[in-house]
């Protein structure tokens, strides 16, 4: 069948990193530079991505494989085959059309990209409060307040790590 | 082809202006949010403005708003960054970026850039 087919089809014989070239007599001839054919038997071959500004090249561009790009320092990347870079904001902040802005008061983000999101509501498990929430870490839950009376095996809170959840701004 | 120029860098004064442009070409510049983004030398890449689609909205990173505003002429494919009172922490190469399809609705990223132009603010 291969055969079948290259005697029906010269360009099924070009490897890839090259095409088959209508303006030679179907001669297979190497991809431009810049250019890339990832498969046999291509007509013409593709634009090599270009990866500048916001993006950085994490592999070049060969004459078999496009260029695969990872975003500059400040920024992450988004969508498949990081098609998108957007920007890093600091823990305790989240990205907005204005930029990064700091967490609300009750919310945390313990990141550098995603939303702010609220401190867990200890109460709702019938849990206390052991370590307040800042707008970089959510709240510690401890024992329930039952669990602290008299008589039961005291816990002893450990000092907190930050400074209490701050006010608004 | 999706392309970005960008132009009008150059070596000022601190206190002095600057304008920036950004040529567009190969898609619908009318349909996109669009940024400048700069980076000095040996830090991280920082966004500085965007402007929506239409211009109706604006925003700039604190450390330079009031002294830059971004703009847009959709009729000739361009953007634009004005520059006054520039410092020396200014200096740096500014990219225009063109948000992503959906950009401002369920994310910030930016899928195409130019090359750069270099500004420097020195005395």
């Known amino acids: 069948f291969e055969r079948t087919r290259s005697l029906q089809d010269p360009c099924s014989n070009c490897p890839a990193g090259t095409f088959c070239d209508n303006n030679r007599n179907q001669i297979c001839s190497p991809c431009p530079p810049n250019s890339f054919s990832s498969a046999g038997g291509q007509r013409t071959c593709d634009i090599c991505r270009q990866c500048k500004g916001v993006f950085r090249t994490r592999k070049e561009c060969s004459s078999t494989s496009n260029a695969e790009c990872d975003c500059t320092p400040g920024f992450h990347c988004l969508g498949a085959g990081c098609s998108m870079c957007e920007q890093d904001c600091k823990q305790g902040q989240e990205l907005t059309k204005k930029g990064c802005k700091d967490c609300c008061f009750g919310t945390f983000n313990d990141q550098k990209r995603g939303i702010c999101r609220p401190w867990t509501n200890c109460s709702l498990d019938g849990k206390s409060v052991l370590v307040n929430g800042t707008k970089e870490r959510d709240v510690v839950c401890g024992p329930s307040p039952a669990d602290l009376s008299p008589g039961a095996s005291s816990v002893t809170p450990p000092a907190p790590a930050r400074e209490p959840g701050h006010s608004p701004q | 082809q999706v392309q970005l120029v960008e132009s009008g860098g150059g070596l000022v004064q601190p206190g002095g202006s600057l304008r920036l442009s950004c040529t567009a070409s190969?898609?619908?510049?009318?349909d996109y949010w669009m940024n400048w983004v700069r980076q000095a030398p040996g830090k991280g890449l920082e966004w500085v403005a965007n402007i929506k689609e239409d211009g109706s909205e604006k925003y700039y990173v604190d450390s330079v708003e009031g002294r830059f505003t971004i703009s847009r002429d959709n009729a000739r494919n361009s953007l634009y960054l004005q520059m006054t009172s520039l410092r020396e922490e200014d200096t740096a190469m500014y990219y225009c970026?063109?948000?992503?399809?959906?950009?401002?609705?369920?994310?910030?990223?930016?899928?195409?850039s130019g090359q750069g132009t270099t500004v420097t603010v020195s005395s």
């Open positions: 970026a063109r948000g992503g399809e959906g950009y401002g609705d369920n994310h910030y990223g930016m899928d195409v």
């Open positions: 190969g898609f619908t510049f009318s």
